[in-house]
């Protein structure tokens, strides 16, 4: 019989008492085969973290700073359940740490030196740890003690709870630095008042502070937020302009064998029976013998943290950067305006080989990082382990939802001004063998399908989106008799046609021979009835253009396109017979790396782009024997995006809507994780 006990860790006598009450009340409402609670008492949260790591306890609820400690080796804990605040309809699991300034003050984030600062309190998250952590490497040396460095960075501050004797500048704007509401500039509202009164130039608070203190929109419009990219935004645009997005209070568990499903089952049942306004005798979110015992008193309920989300992703790049800077206190030798090498994310070992050759030729400008799937690469870019990669539009959508931005677009047509003219896109098509003359768009049911990969534009999002509109369900594996759609569940009929060996079968990378445009076309040639690819795929792999044994004798005339009106046309008539226009592949990165990625890639394409004529004796960035490694092989250049610099603007309203409609069919664990952080 599986052990269905969750050992909750308590850090005080009062918590232990509430835990026992929790245990007893759960026993009374949950069947004997359901989850149960046991209580483990430890002296501190850090002891609880160690106990969970050592399998002496299973769960504890932590503030963001401790979630970071819990994630560090050797603890390796992960977030599994989040408390939410507000309403069930609009649950808030995160708050945003922001830098508020007066509208007419005219300076940016990188011009804070010498300004006057208002903090909620020394050592507090939004008011100190996050802003000072992010500014850490700009502080004057020596950076220890930290208070002295901060005092020398700003021209005056109010940092309640600081030592006014040792660091008088930190108390300059609020004599005495009182550590309670007796100090008019203490806490969130106090720090905002410090700015409002004109004592300070910037207040480090949370996003809700300004709304709580200024009910009138006209008053709020006198303030702005400083963004990390050295721009400003209105105060209601905090989701796009903040220092960090911070989880409020989170249940953590072991990453391996952590009972996360059981913990969720327990807490979900607990909130049903003992949540807000549920029961008089025991209340989960109430602490008669103290404050915030086991859970925050202000919590309204629990939400399950998506399984794909580790602590780094949950806490977010900015928060992790700030806390790591404060804890480790390491900065680059001397901050320079020069760009650090761009860490390119390579999929599997084939892309890694090409990336390595690029890295050797780039003379220190490009480094390589490997991952097994595109989603793993996106996650690595999010958390700073990698910086950039080029993505199909379907993954530009996911990357965008995860906070990444497009920075350059692949262009596929030769033109005089290639780098300045991003193209409208390419065509997504459905290809069949000419010999299968009875096959049309209207009778694909029961046929064998070949897809570039799940989540990609031409191979999945466009054809499956159109199909979904017709069949109104997501069971595509039942619609087709079998197929190869790399990235599908291994036991799905949409992995049956795939050719990868062993663990590589149906993997969404080049270890699966039927992956990508060329792979999907090969799948059609060898096994399938229809392939969903781009309009250039057939000509690029026929007429001897692809020397691989399976392709070298193929003839373009032996293939036709399926049109949406039920007719068929020759391959060259793609402009009048396609499924939809697809946005070109684009390079994505984090916002903080945007300028450097743009600069370095433009240098790199001038050195190794399509101006290189002899690819046998020179490194060519856009060549890989029809395998589309790192970039599509038909890329002519990487083009500036001009104002199409967000994923929505880049992909276009129509495509974003189409992918949004297909979201209900999404199997993307990363998309689920990212929409948890930003619904």
């Amino acid at each position: 019989v599986p052990d269905k006990t969750v050992r909750w860790c308590a850090v005080s006598e009062h918590e232990a008492t509430k835990c026992q009450s929790f245990r007893d009340h759960m026993k009374s409402v949950i069947p004997s085969d359901g989850p149960s609670v046991a209580c483990v008492k430890k002296a501190s949260y850090l002891d609880c973290i160690r106990a969970i790591a050592a399998n002496e306890a299973d769960a504890v609820t932590l503030d963001a700073g401790l979630v970071y400690d819990a994630y560090l080796a050797p603890n390796n804990l992960k977030p599994v359940v989040a408390e939410f605040y507000g309403s069930k309809e609009d649950p808030q699991t995160f708050y945003y740490a922001v830098a508020v300034v007066k509208k007419d003050s005219g300076f940016q984030m990188n011009q804070l030196r010498g300004k006057k600062s208002c903090h909620t309190g020394l050592g507090r998250s939004a008011g100190w740890n996050i802003p000072i952590g992010l500014l850490y490497c700009d502080l004057p040396e020596p950076r220890k003690p930290l208070e002295k460095a901060v005092a020398n960075f700003f021209s005056g501050s109010c940092a309640p709870c600081a030592d006014g004797t040792d660091f008088p500048q930190l108390c300059q704007l609020c004599p005495g630095c009182g550590c309670s509401t007796l100090n008019q500039y203490f806490g969130y509202s106090g720090a905002f008042k410090c700015l409002k009164d004109g004592a300070g130039d910037v207040a480090f608070v949370k996003h809700s502070t300004i709304f709580e203190n200024l009910a009138n929109k006209a008053d709020r419009d006198q303030y702005e937020l400083l963004c990390l990219d050295n721009t400003r935004k209105p105060v209601d645009e905090y989701k796009d302009c903040h220092l960090a997005q911070v989880p409020s209070h989170t249940v953590v568990a072991r990453s391996m064998g952590g009972k996360e499903d059981l913990i969720w089952e327990l807490l979900n049942q607990a909130q049903e029976h003992f949540g807000k306004d549920k029961s008089k005798e025991f209340q989960l979110f109430s602490s008669p013998h103290g404050k915030d015992l086991l859970f925050k008193d202000s919590a309204h309920g629990f939400l399950k943290v998506p399984p794909r989300m580790d602590a780094k992703m949950y806490l977010g790049y900015e928060y992790v950067t700030a806390i790591r800077n404060l804890r480790e206190g390491t900065c680059p030798e001397a901050p320079t305006d020069e760009c650090k090498p761009v860490k390119w994310c390579a999929l599997s070992h084939h892309e890694r080989l090409k990336c390595d050759e690029w890295s050797v030729n780039s003379v220190g400008k490009i480094e390589c990082v490997s991952a097994e799937t595109t989603e793993d690469c996106i996650a690595k870019i999010m958390n700073g382990e990698a910086d950039a990669m080029s993505l199909d539009g379907g993954f530009v959508y996911i990357a965008g939802k995860c906070g990444l931005v497009p920075v350059l677009a692949e262009n596929y047509n030769k033109s005089d001004n290639c780098e300045d003219t991003p193209e409208a896109g390419y065509f997504a098509i459905a290809v069949v063998k000419k010999s299968a003359s009875d096959l049309t768009w209207d009778n694909l049911k029961g046929k064998k399908s070949c897809h570039t990969a799940v989540g990609r534009t031409a191979g999945w999002n466009i054809p499956m989106g159109l199909l979904y509109n017709k069949i109104n369900h997501c069971r595509f594996d039942e619609f087709f008799s079998e197929g190869c759609a790399p990235g599908s569940k291994k036991d799905s009929s949409l992995c049956k046609l795939c050719m990868g060996s062993g663990l590589n079968l149906c993997e969404p990378n080049n270890k699966e021979g039927y992956y990508g445009y060329t792979g999907a076309f090969r799948c059609l040639v060898e096994k399938g009835d229809v392939a969903f690819v781009k309009h250039q795929t057939v000509p690029q792999n026929t007429g001897g253009k692809n020397p691989d044994p399976w392709a070298k004798n193929l003839n373009e005339k032996d293939y036709e396109l399926l049109c949406l009106d039920g007719t068929r046309k020759p391959v060259e008539e793609y402009a009048n017979c396609h499924l939809a226009r697809a946005p070109n592949h684009a390079v994505v990165t984090r916002k903080d790396k945007e300028a450097c990625v743009h600069k370095i890639l433009r240098q790199q394409q001038h050195l190794f782009g399509s101006n290189v004529t002899d690819c046998s004796g020179n490194f060519c960035l856009f060549r890989s024997e029809t395998k589309d490694l790192l970039f599509r092989d038909d890329t002519v250049c990487l083009a500036k995006l001009h104002d199409r610099n967000t994923y929505e603007k880049y992909l276009g309203e129509e495509y974003v809507k189409a992918v949004g409609n297909l979201r209900k069919c999404s199997t993307s664990s990363l998309l689920e994780a990212c929409t948890f952080r930003r619904p």
Partner: nanobody, 117 residues
Framework: EVQLVECGGGLVQPGGSLRLSCAAS????????MAWYRQAPGQQRELVAG???????KYADSVKGRFTISRDNAKNTLYLQMNSLKPEDTAVYYC???????????WGQGTQVTVSS
């Protein structure tokens, strides 16, 4: 297509040195990039050092300052001078010229380097 044969590996004590050679069956003068990779048991193959025709070099962080890659186009040979060897340098070392493309899973026999006391 140029064939490459690695040699020069062996057993060496920590702190010791070895010089690996990679002999090509044809001219390497027109080959742009050549590199040494290594693979330890149960690990992925990783880039150790690379060199371009113009002499630009790149090293893995773990070998910087200890290993030196060079090429002699007249002798059609690629070298890897390995000093201050550590137990974690133990692996099979391979050379490549990338000319078979990134997709061919062709690697030579390699040469075993074992660093142990």
């Amino acid at each position: 297509e140029v064939q490459l044969v690695e040699c020069g590996g062996g057993l060496v004590q920590p702190g010791g040195s070895l010089r690996l050679s990679c002999a090509a069956s044809g001219s390497i003068a027109s080959i742009n990039t050549m590199a040494w990779y290594r693979q330890a048991p149960g690990q992925q193959r990783e880039l150790v050092a690379g060199i371009t025709r113009g002499g630009s070099t790149k090293y893995a962080d773990s070998v910087k300052g200890r290993f030196t890659i060079s090429r002699d186009n007249a002798k059609n040979t690629l070298y890897l001078q390995m000093n201050s060897l550590k137990p974690e340098d133990t692996a099979v070392y391979y050379c490549t010229d990338y000319s078979r493309g990134y997709y061919q899973d062709y690697w030579g026999q390699g040469t075993q380097v074992t660093v142990s006391s």
